[in-house]
């Protein structure tokens, strides 16, 4: 009996035309939503003039339907048993699941001012930037609509730069009509224990963002894992959103719509400093902001963002060191709301429910030559927004899963 089930599972989780796995893999049958909470800055003037703590108030959720588009350019390679594809990006606003509209206004850090002052460290260049910032009436903070902040707006300061630069700025710009990849993953035909594991991303086995093992593309994309998952396993996966591979460990047994699943969570150790977790030494890319690699809970992904000083963390700086959140007032981290988890059906390795949570932050530093940053007395890692991307297997699919998979085993 067990061998027959194993044989059937092995057959059905292969990523090729005709299998259950392939059908759901090409176009997810699960509705995936991405909720955003924006950190609205309450005291922009005090921060700019007196280098006060930044008082933030989160506003949300603003919800978008995502991952509804089928994978594109799906190409099987029989020679190395891989399948390559592009994952198209798309987002549709869901007013009924949101607290307001895409036209809602927020006071946030001026992304262009913070980024330009970081990228161009030369003092003379900063003086040129300063005159353009002043001319465009830009400041350290700006008021932007949700749509602008997420999907892009023409920045008045960058528009004055007299040589070619991208003048459109947005946290997720460009997004619609773009695609992530190319991914090339093992289809599992020759070795089911490799199914869905990424072979290459954008044609490479490494990212070129990090040193040593930190630069490796490990595991799957977290949508599924090779079958017969054990509780003792450490599940590796790659997330292009955070420009790195990361891992999850077993936390508890969960019953999801009558299906027994394993809840795997991202442990705090994954976000620890190299002092606590020596494996993380290569995620520490500079010594000043990281206080000689003793700070933790924030990841500098500037190398992956054309030099823009983007830092990724968990929402509300969950699992981050006190020095990171100290200059920010209004944050309340809690594990239940702010950690990332994956609910995995262990026989198939399919992720039937997940909550991926992350926060986008931008570093802003004092600048002697940029007037609007002149009065700052310290560096700030400024939270801009946090997101919660969730997906849960639908009732119909759950019934099918119970009858065809878990029901047969029990």
């Amino acid at each position: 009996g067990d061998l027959l089930i194993q044989k059937t599972i092995k057959k059905q989780v292969v990523l090729e035309e005709g299998t259950i796995a392939f059908k759901n893999w090409v176009k997810t049958g699960t509705e995936v939503y991405r909720q955003f909470w924006i950190f609205d800055v309450q005291n922009p003037q005090e921060v700019m003039m007196n280098s006060s703590n930044i008082q933030v108030k989160q506003r949300g959720p603003y919800t978008y339907r995502v991952r509804f588009l089928a994978k594109e350019n799906v190409t099987q390679d029989a020679e190395d048993n891989t399948v390559s594809f592009l994952q198209p990006n798309g987002a549709i606003f869901e007013p009924s699941l949101s607290v307001g509209t895409e036209a809602d206004n927020f006071t946030v850090l001026n992304l262009a001012v913070a980024a330009a002052s970081h990228i161009y460290q030369n003092q003379f260049v900063q003086m040129i930037l300063n005159s353009l910032i002043n001319k465009s009436k830009s400041s350290m903070f700006q008021v932007r609509t949700l749509r602008e902040l997420l999907w892009g707006y023409r920045d008045p300061f960058l528009s004055l730069v007299p040589y070619p630069v991208t003048t459109t700025v947005g946290l997720f710009y460009p997004y619609n009509n773009t695609a992530d990849g190319v991914y090339k993953v093992f289809n599992g035909k020759d070795n089911i224990s490799k199914v869905a594991i990424i072979d290459t991303y954008k044609g490479k086995r490494n990212l070129s963002y990090w040193e040593s093992h930190c630069d490796m593309i490990n595991g799957t994309d977290a949508a599924s894992f090779p079958p017969f998952v054990e509780k003792s396993q450490v599940l590796q996966f790659f997330s292009s959103d955070i420009c790195r591979s990361i891992y999850a460990v077993f936390e508890s047994d969960v019953n999801l719509k009558g299906i027994p699943v394993y809840r795997f969570v991202l442990p705090s150790k994954a976000f620890a400093s190299p002092v606590e977790n020596p494996d993380n030494y290569c995620f520490c890319t500079e010594k000043i902001i990281s206080k000689n690699c003793t700070s933790y809970g924030v990841l500098d992904i500037s190398k992956c963002k054309e030099g823009r000083p983007v830092y990724i963390s968990l929402p509300h700086f969950l699992y981050a060191s006190p020095d990171v959140s100290e200059p920010i007032d209004g944050l309340n981290p809690n594990e239940e709301e702010h950690r990332t988890y994956l609910d995995i059906e262990p026989i198939t390795g399919f992720t039937l429910q997940f909550a991926k949570r992350l926060q986008v932050n931008l570093l802003v530093k004092p600048s002697e030559k940029i007037q609007v940053l002149k009065n700052l007395k310290r560096n700030y890692i400024v939270p801009i927004l946090w997101l919660n991307e969730t997906g849960t297997i639908g009732d119909e699919k759950a019934n099918m899963f119970r009858s065809q998979v878990t029901g047969k085993i029990n």
Epitope: Y120, N122, Q123, F124, V125, M127, S131, Y163, K369, Q371
Partner: antibody
Framework: EVQLVQSGAEVKKPGSSVKVSCKAS????????MQWVRQAPGQGLEWMGG????????AYAQKFQGRVTLTADKSTSTAYMELSSLRSEDTAVYYC????????WGQGTLVTVSS | ETTVTQSPAFMSATPGDKVTISCITS??????MNWYQQKPGEPPKLLIS???TLRPGVPSRFSSSGYGTDFTFTINNIESEDAAYYYC?????????FGQGTKLEIK
Amino acid sequence: EVQLVQSGAEVKKPGSSVKVSCKASGYRFSDYEMQWVRQAPGQGLEWMGGIDPETGGIAYAQKFQGRVTLTADKSTSTAYMELSSLRSEDTAVYYCTRKLDFDYWGQGTLVTVSS
Amino acid sequence: ETTVTQSPAFMSATPGDKVTISCITSTDIDDDMNWYQQKPGEPPKLLISEGSTLRPGVPSRFSSSGYGTDFTFTINNIESEDAAYYYCLQSDNLPLTFGQGTKLEIK
């Protein structure tokens, strides 16, 4: 040792253009911006503009905007200042000088504008 | 634009004297003031850069002070070789602006 060597003296007719070169040595050219300063006979110093060879960032004094063009050739570590529509009041010694604090200076290039 | 008013335009001193030159700016420039010496037929020479930093090789009799809008350049125990023009330059904002210069004559 840091050296800035400028091109030789020029005599120009009103309405014409002049291009002064400044060859840098003794340091990595793209590490520092190059500024240009002029001094009319018996007068004080006047900043004209500056260029950062690394980014191509340029700033000009309002007075010279539209008449002066600064360029930098990283391959030869040379900065250039071109001044067009010359008039007699442009007769001056033109200096290239390094960085925001003008720490090293070229020997100067005398440009005489005369009909 | 930050205007820089330098005074006096001319001064005369005897070796051993102490002289001071003043530069006042129309806007707050923190400590971004530089001081130069220029002798006839030569390019200017940087003596003191931002933050009253004496350049290597410049004698310690030269000093400066000031912050914001008021700046002072001092030569203690003047020597005959100090006869020259002296200029201040603000490097806080664009356009960079010089003072009008001070001619120092040694009697």
